[in-house]
């Protein structure tokens, strides 16, 4: 998910259009209705690390 100006949210977070900021994907199990949780489902988990630069 991309924040305005193409600044990406940090790993484990996703952009919320409803709140105009990056939100922590960790809150999605407790409240999956949040708009940013769709982006969390498509994003790699917080512990994921790229294997190349």
């Amino acid at each position: 998910e991309q924040a305005p100006g193409n600044a990406p949210c940090s790993s484990g977070s996703s952009w919320s259009a409803d709140l105009d900021k990056c939100m922590d994907c960790a809150s999605c199990p407790a409240r999956p209705h949040s708009d940013f949780c769709l982006g969390c489902a498509a994003a790699p988990p917080a512990h994921f690390r790229m294997l190349w630069p």
Partner: antibody
Framework: EVQLLESGGGLVQPGGSLRLSCAAS????????MIWVRQAPGKGLEWVSY????????HYADSVKGRFTISRDNSKNTLYLQMNSLRAEDTAVYYC?????????????WGQGTLVTVSS | DIQMTQSPSSLSASVGDRVTITCRAS??????LNWYQQKPGKAPKLLIY???SLQSGVPSRFSGSGSGTDFTLTISSLQPEDFATYYC??????????FGQGTKVEIK
Amino acid sequence: EVQLLESGGGLVQPGGSLRLSCAASGFTFSPYPMIWVRQAPGKGLEWVSYISPSGGSTHYADSVKGRFTISRDNSKNTLYLQMNSLRAEDTAVYYCARGGDTYFDYFDYWGQGTLVTVSS
Amino acid sequence: DIQMTQSPSSLSASVGDRVTITCRASQSISGYLNWYQQKPGKAPKLLIYQASSLQSGVPSRFSGSGSGTDFTLTISSLQPEDFATYYCQQSYTSPFITFGQGTKVEIK
């Protein structure tokens, strides 16, 4: 001191239009989500509409969808509710309220309300 | 939509009484439940957010508890200024929020 002051209510005929305003002061308006809530005479509270801090995201109750439009002007610290095709059942006191700091879980400041009466 | 049901719809109590109002959600809302107080002709006032957190400036005689579907607002010792209508509100489905129908606390 945080203040929200609604205006624009009044008597309107069925099918008519009104534009409500909510002037905010005492805080930085632009980072906060805002909502409109209404209360019919002698009844409970009903959520009407939500707008994100930038105004880019809006949501509506089914009862007003397609007839009401929420908007905001952050340069003027003002929230709006354009109400078209008004019906008798839209008669209510309309309140604006500010969303909480980190999320829109709760609404910590409310205006005093403005009365909208839809009647012929 | 999630329905919020408050009980009782109204109650009569005396100054000094312990008052309990309950709010039940039609499905689990975790702890995303807020309580408001409204006096006649006035705007609602936030008392409790996220089920049990006391809003700044609200007297400590107000407390909230519960999780899932069942929640409680308690006034430990009712004061004259507490006679009002109380509403619960769920924010689990925010920004599509819903309120309970209200509980009117009257003087006995």
